[in-house]
Structure formats: structure tokens, C-alpha cells
């Protein structure tokens, strides 16, 4: 189920690549965030907290990512036209409960000016 389009700027372009921003509520302590391209899982990141508040970050499908207290950024490089697609942030909240899954996303448009290695 798609809950809606992102209510923030999801795509940030720089240096022929794109940063895809996936937000989560900053109250959330344990979660899994997946980046989907269409229906395919491109990246995932799971944050858990153990005893003594030990934080563990795991990735089954690794992408260059960056975690903050309310977002996960996934980075895609060497953009070309094949990257144009719908991208979704699939968030599974584990703690604090209730368990909740939300899917938000948007369409990544690729313009010539954003491509990595344009022929001059």
C-alpha cells in the first residue's frame, strides 16, 4: 500500500549523483528503512538498540547511506536515464510501538544537466 507522496524534497542532486532522503519520526529508536526502485529493493538499513542503549546498524542490501536522528539518506551515483523511475522509502517502525509500515515516494526525473558525464 502506498501511503502517499513524500511531503518534503526527496531528491537532492549533486555531482552527477542523487541523494534520496527518507524521513522517519525522530521519536523512533528502532526501524528498518528500505529504498525501492519500482518494486525492487535497492538498499536497506536497519537500526536496533540493544541493552545499555547500544546502537546497531545493519544493511542487507548495502548502498552508501547516511543516518541522522530523523532521516536516512541513500546515495546513487553515475546517474543516467535508466535511473528515472518511481522511488519509495519503505519504513518499518519497531520501537516505540505500535509496529507500523509506511511507503512514501516520488518520481525521479533525470534531466541532461544532472547526468554524470555529459559529452560537451
Amino acid at each position: 500500500e502506498i501511503n502517499g507522496s513524500a511531503n518534503y524534497e526527496m531528491f537532492i542532486f549533486h555531482n552527477g549523483g542523487v541523494q534520496i532522503l527518507c524521513k522517519y519520526p525522530d521519536i523512533v529508536q528502532q526501524f528498518k528503512m528500505q529504498l525501492l526502485k519500482g518494486g525492487q529493493i535497492l538498499c536497506d538499513l536497519t537500526k536496533t538498540k540493544g541493552s545499555g542503549n547500544t546502537v546497531s546498524i545493519k544493511s542487507l542490501k548495502f548502498c552508501h547511506s547516511q543516518l541522522s536522528n530523523n532521516s536516512v539518506s541513500f546515495f546513487l551515483y553515475n546517474l543516467d536515464h535508466s535511473h528515472a523511475n518511481y522511488y519509495f522509502c519503505n519504513l518499518s517502525i519497531f520501537d516505540p510501538p505500535p509496529f507500523k509500515v509506511t511507503l512514501t515516494g516520488g518520481y525521479l526525473h533525470i534531466y541532461e544537466s544532472q547526468l554524470c558525464c555529459q559529452l560537451k
Epitope: 501511503n3 502517499g4 511531503n7 518534503y8 524521513k23 519520526p25 525522530d26 521519536i27 523512533v28 529508536q29 528502532q30 538498540k49 530523523n70 517502525i93 520501537d95 516505540p96 510501538p97 505500535p98 509496529f99 507500523k100 509506511t102 512514501t104
Partner: antibody
Framework: QVQLVQSGAEVKKPGSSVKVSCKAS????????MHWVRQAPGQGLEWMGL????????NYNQKFQGRVTITADKSTSTAYMELSSLRSEDTAVYYC??????????????WGQGTTVTVSS | EIVLTQSPATLSLSPGERATLSCSAS?????MHWYQQKPGQAPRLLIY???KLASGIPARFSGSGSGTDFTLTISSLEPEDFAVYYC?????????FGQGTKLEIK
């Protein structure tokens, strides 16, 4: 139906502590986190903190850090909020509120009826 | 701390009129929630995620806005709508409420 029932009114002396209870029914207690919010007379609402029932993880408003302790007893489906070193400014109605999520944010979807705490010498 | 400023502090209207309540945040928030409180009662959730109607809330209530400016609208006031309304943000710690708008009968 989903209900949060809080303990009765308390009158406390400055410097003492108060422990307010919030008994949940109509849902699985460990499936939700619980927040505490207070409202001083004629004032607005103030978030105090929360507890994740299943992990016991707590998160407090820094304003109350060191004075507030939120706990939960899974066996009785009851959450507790204890406030120590009471002063007159702590006179307020204290509410528990159940945590829930929308697509983008979190909110309190069910509230207790409130517990009046009066701090007076 | 994100400060939420509600305006007006008091709004005097008659049943059947349209009410527009504002909530302004001192810095940008991702979403806003709205609560209604009647004397001697606990607050009740009206709107979550800026514009979504909570369960059991009549369709005359609606929410809108983004960034720092949010609005709660009641399209046609019913006698039971006269109460205090609070906005709430859970985007930035510590999580804060507005000071409230009292909606009273004119």
C-alpha cells in the same frame, strides 16, 4: 473499547514525590508506547516523556530530566509516571496518552482522564 | 525548542459560521496535529499528519498547511465545537504544543 484509566487526585508537600498510574484496557498493552503530558492551571499542554512498553526504552523532555521516571508493569497493563522534588509549579493535571503513527508523524490517539496533582505546603 | 504560536487567542463566532484557526511554528516542521479540549476533559485528537481526520471526527473539520504555517478550519460551527484547540508538533525534540485558541460563542 480502548481505555486509559488514571489514579485519583493527589495533594503533596514541596520536596516530596508523586506517582501517578495509568491502567490500559481494550488493547494489547505491549503493542503501544505511552506518553505523559501535563497541563498547569489555565496553561497549555507540555510533553513530559514516553515509555516503550515492550522494550522499556524511555525518552524524557530535558526540562524534567532527573526528576521524572516513567515505568510500566506489563502484568497489570499499567504505566506509571513518578515526579520527584515537587515544587508549587508542578501543580497540574497529568495525562497519559497512547502513542500512534500516521504516514509522517506520531501523535497521542487515546488519553487518560487526567490526574490532578496539587503541590502545597 | 520549536515554539508554536496560535492565533487568535480567542475567537468569538456564532453557530453556522466558518472558523479558521492558525498555528505558526518558529522553525519548519514536517506535520502538525490538532487537539480539541473541553473544560474538565482530556484533549481529543481531531487532525493528524496536518490534514488527516481522526476516527469519529466529523468532516466539517479540516487541516492544511506546511513548513511553518498551519490551519485548522471548521466549515460550519456546531454548538459542541466551542472549546479550546491546540496544535502539536512531534517533528522536533522537545515536542511542543501551541498555547491554544479558545473558540467561544458570540
Amino acid at each position: 473499547q480502548v481505555q486509559l484509566v488514571q489514579s485519583g487526585a493527589e495533594v503533596k508537600k514541596p520536596g516530596s514525590s508523586v506517582k501517578v498510574s495509568c491502567k490500559a484496557s481494550g488493547y494489547t498493552f505491549t503493542d503501544y508506547a505511552m506518553h505523559w503530558v501535563r497541563q498547569a492551571p489555565g496553561q497549555g499542554l507540555e510533553w513530559m516523556g514516553l515509555i516503550s512498553i515492550y522494550s522499556d526504552h524511555t525518552n524524557y523532555n530535558q526540562k524534567f530530566q532527573g526528576r521524572v521516571t516513567i515505568t510500566a508493569d506489563k502484568s497489570t497493563s499499567t504505566a506509571y509516571m513518578e515526579l520527584s522534588s515537587l515544587r508549587s509549579e508542578d501543580t497540574a493535571v497529568y495525562y497519559c496518552g497512547r502513542n500512534n503513527y500516521g504516514n509522517y508523524g506520531w501523535y497521542f490517539d487515546v488519553w487518560g482522564q487526567g490526574t490532578t496533582v496539587t503541590v502545597s505546603s | 525548542e520549536i515554539v508554536l504560536t496560535q492565533s487568535p487567542a480567542t475567537l468569538s463566532l456564532s453557530p453556522g459560521e466558518r472558523a479558521t484557526l492558525s498555528c505558526s511554528a518558529s522553525s519548519s516542521v514536517s506535520y502538525m496535529h490538532w487537539y480539541q479540549q473541553k473544560p474538565g476533559q482530556a484533549p481529543r485528537l481531531l487532525i493528524y499528519d496536518t490534514s488527516k481526520l481522526a476516527s469519529g471526527i466529523p468532516a466539517r473539520f479540516s487541516g492544511s498547511g506546511s513548513g511553518t504555517d498551519f490551519t485548522l478550519t471548521i466549515s460550519s460551527l456546531e454548538p459542541e465545537d466551542f472549546a479550546v484547540y491546540y496544535c502539536f508538533q512531534g517533528s522536533g525534540y522537545p515536542y511542543t504544543f501551541g498555547q491554544g485558541t479558545k473558540l467561544e460563542i458570540k
